[in-house]
Interface confidence: medium
Amino acid sequence: DFGLDCDEHSTESRCCRYPLTVDFEAFGWDWIIAPKRYKANYCSGECEFVFLQKYPHTHLVHQANPRGSAGPCCTPTKMSPINMLYFNGKEQIIYGKIPAMVVDRCGCS
Amino acid sequence: DFGLDCDEHSTESRCCRYPLTVDFEAFGWDWIIAPKRYKANYCSGECEFVFLQKYPHTHLVHQANPRGSAGPCCTPTKMSPINMLYFNGKEQIIYGKIPAMVVDRCGCS
């Protein structure tokens, strides 16, 4: 499994992982105590046939070509959690591992 | 976690799981000894903002709105394996569990 990494200067048109810092403060999300910002990354780019396909299933659906199947799209294929400190709805402070907050790899699925 | 299930008569335009039988015989993939066909399913439909979003990350990227982020797309969010009997490149018969061959759930990511 591998995926492409790009940045804002890249000319890559294919599915790629780009850097993105999410800033909770800028969103006005004050219930998040920490972190105030974190590196989330995101996926963007074209999914030519077979390029970076995560699953054999993606290839099979392309082969079978059913009505309405739009072809694969560039989406996270590996994600990781971050630890966060935040207020829940009852205004209790919670410290927890929040899954799937960081994109580690992008692929076509 | 939940996802919509549709069939060929559905009028649902949103991200949905549709039935699809993959027929290896019809593809001429005779190196696959068994199964000759299986229920693979596929994902299709529109991803309106927040509908069926699998990850908080999806929402955050939408909020941050970086250059080139295309918005979420309808993609498998839960997949399961099938057992297969096939010839490898050395013409040895292999029996194994092949991951991510069946779409169990679709969502927007």
Epitope: - | I33, A34, N83, L85, F87, E91
Partner: antibody, heavy 124, light 107 residues
Amino acid sequence: QVQLVQSGAEVKKPGASVKISCKASGYSFTGYFMHWVRQAPGQGLEWIGNIYPYNGVSNYNQRFKAKATLTVDKSTSTAYMELRSLRSDDTAVYYCARRYYYGTGPADWYYDVWGQGTLVTVSS
Amino acid sequence: DIQMTQSPSSLSASVGDRVTITCKASQDINSYLSWFQQKPGKAPKSLIYRANRLVDGVPSKFSGSGSGQDYTLTISSLQPEDFATYYCLQSDEFPLTFGQGTKLEIK
């Protein structure tokens, strides 16, 4: 429907060879194992071997390794078995049979279709 | 090679009888056992696979059971068309091996 049609009866002299055929129809020939089984007069069934037509990969009963050669012609969907150095005790009915996979395990098979059999008589 | 011992080698029974044929393997065959019926001058016909599963189109009067080394075929109510020779086959290991057959005759 799925059918296996075998070639007609043969009479051969000891030491000769014979090639019998099994023509498949009604299914994708290359994707199913073809097995061969023999039955001597008044006797039981004996497994000779099998072949996967897609790539010609075959397995033989050690007892028949020097006796039988299994081949296929994909263009005509036909399986062949050649028997060499014939002796009188090779006199038998020879059957081809398709092996069908029904399950999820490595040995989940059964014979779903048989040929009608080819009688090979070896006599001087 | 795995040896398959079938018993009895012949059996006389009457129409309406219930009969049982047994097959013993020389080692555990993990239920990879099939049963066949053969009539004179005809190819064998598959009845049961995986020890107890009925082949499509085979009447339910035929049933199979067993595990490990010991297996049985039962015909619940014999009809005239059931008088034939029956064979078992193990497919757990190459070479595949058949039992020597049980000839079922009308009494």
